[in-house]
């Protein structure tokens, strides 16, 4: 695949180890942590990226109202179990045998239990709402220009098909990007909205996953956009199952 042949690196994932040991001496890259081969012509799955992140040395984070079933990733980082395709396994457990069910973006969608907890299927996150607040800017952003620039970003940088960017809302200083992708809509080779959202989230935090690129420079008619706060809401095809105790907390 298209890892850079000359110096054998993975353009879409710097959390890899690459060597020219593929067929015919081609460059092959493996994700840190899992050792799984990755396709450097597209985004790496969030599960493999999280696993790589946990294995890496630690350094000495008119607008839409999120649905009542929307999940926010409050649990933070964990070392996930990934299936052979690099997707999250439906059930995740930690070293103390505490288990929980996750959705396709790896966010917990049930109460925590023990090893007897069953997660019958990996429930797909089909709607992601990215809520940003930009810092004050000298020049105002035009909504249609902002919309076009964000759609261009997801298409060109994250290789997400334009049809999956459902809407861009703007009420200064809040920007909301809606990504939608049902199981039936996602064809082979399509970037998953969860992976695109994760790459975007890391870019926005100044932690780009791309090899050798500087930070993301996002401009609208030349005016730089700087982000002060990010919140991401995840909506699953099947609503999450939490106890009433958690919902009233």
């Amino acid at each position: 695949h298209t890892a850079a042949q000359d110096n054998c690196t993975c353009p879409t994932n710097k959390m890899t180890v690459c060597s020219p040991d593929g067929p015919g001496g081609r460059c092959q890259c493996r994700a840190l942590g899992s050792g799984m081969a990755v396709d450097c012509s597209t985004l790496t799955s969030k599960c493999l990226l999280l696993k790589a992140r946990m294995s890496a040395p630690k350094n000495a984070r008119t607008l839409v109202r999120p649905s009542e079933h929307a999940l926010v990733d409050n649990d933070g980082l964990y070392d996930p179990d990934c299936d052979p395709e690099g997707r999250f396994k439906a059930r995740q457990c930690n070293q103390t045998s505490v288990c929980w069910c996750v959705n396709s973006v790896g966010v917990r969608r049930t109460d925590k239990g023990d090893l007897s907890l069953r997660c019958d299927e990996l429930v797909r996150t089909h709607h992601i709402l990215i809520d940003l607040r930009h810092r004050p800017t000298a020049g105002a952003f035009n909504h249609s220009d902002l919309d076009a620039e964000l759609r261009r970003l997801f298409r060109e940088r994250y290789r997400l098909h334009p049809k999956f960017v459902a809407a861009v809302h703007y009420e200064q200083p809040t920007i909301q990007i809606e990504l939608r992708q049902n199981t039936s809509q996602k064809a082979a080779g399509d970037v998953d909205i969860g992976d695109a959202a994760y790459y975007f989230e890391r870019d926005i935090k100044g932690e780009s996953l791309f090899q050798g690129r500087g930070g993301l420079d996002l401009r609208v008619r030349g005016e730089p956009l700087q982000v002060e706060r990010t919140l991401i809401y995840y909506l699953d095809e099947i609503p999450p199952k939490f106890s009433m105790k958690r919902l009233t907390a």
Epitope: P136, A138, K205, G206, G215, D217, R221, G222, Q226
Partner: antibody
Framework: EVQLQQSGPDLVRPGASVKLSCKAS????????INWVKQRPGQGLEWIGW????????KYNEKFKGKATLTVDTSSSTAYMEVHSLTSEDSAVYFC???????????????WGQGTSVTVSS | AIVLTQSPAIMSASPGEKVTMTCSAS?????IYWYQRKPGSSPRLLIY???NLASGVPVRFSGSGSGTSYSLTISRMEAEDAATYYC?????????FGAGTKLELK
């Protein structure tokens, strides 16, 4: 190393125009805006405007609209500023400076060109 | 336009002395940028986004402030710090600079 190289000093007649150049090297020219700043002898710094080479977007200080015109030639990584209808008030050192930015920070004007001295005299 | 007033206009300091200069904005700004200019040289960025040190700038320089009041501090004056210092705002157009603080070596 990021560098901006400006054209040499110019002595021009009142009423004429002058076109100053600023050649960029050491980075992707289209990735950051080029700003122009004026400094008259013994005076402070005055922002004229910026141009973003990737799409040609421009922003001018209202005071310099009609007085200065900003353009770029991406093929040679060069920014230009033409100053029109020159008077003694336009005698100054003109600097170009690039501004890098990411979604995290605005990195300010860095680096600056060495400046071009323009003297308007008959 | 936002007016930036720098004070003092001129000051002098001995080597090793702590130096503080201020920049006051006519209306609230979110960030301030500081530049150093020596005679015969072009301006050099020192501080971006109020408090971040630009690449290659000695750690004796620091910036702070919020709203309408900002400052640049040199923890220990060195001979090479003699220069004129300008603050600048990027909050609204036109971008404006202060008139400068000239720092001389005592």
């Amino acid at each position: 190393e990021v560098q901006l190289q400006q054209s040499g000093p110019d002595l021009v007649r009142p009423g004429a125009s002058v076109k100053l150049s600023c050649k960029a090297s050491g980075y992707t020219f289209t990735s950051s805006d080029i700003n122009w700043v004026k400094q008259r002898p013994g005076q402070g710094l005055e922002w004229i405007g910026w141009i973003y080479p990737r799409d040609g977007s421009k922003k001018y200080n209202e005071k310099f609209k009609g007085k200065a015109t900003l353009t770029v030639d991406t093929s040679s990584s060069t920014a230009y500023m033409e100053v029109h209808s020159l008077t003694s008030e336009d005698s100054a050192v003109y600097f170009c400076a690039t501004r890098f930015a990411t979604v995290v920070s605005n990195y300010g004007l860095d680096p600056w060109g060495q400046g071009t001295s323009v003297t308007v005299s008959s | 336009a936002i007016v930036l007033t720098q004070s003092p206009a001129i000051m002098s300091a001995s080597p090793g002395e702590k130096v503080t200069m201020t920049c006051s904005a006519s209306s609230s700004v979110n960030y301030i940028y500081w530049y150093q200019r020596k005679p015969g040289s072009s301006p050099r960025l020192l501080i971006y986004d109020t408090s971040n040190l630009a690449s290659g700038v000695p750690v004796r320089f620091s910036g702070s402030g919020s709203g309408t009041s900002y400052s640049l501090t040199i923890s220990r004056m060195e001979a090479e710090d003699a220069a004129t210092y300008y603050c600048q705002q990027w909050n609204s157009y036109p971008l404006t600079f202060g008139a400068g603080t000239k720092l001389e070596l005592k």
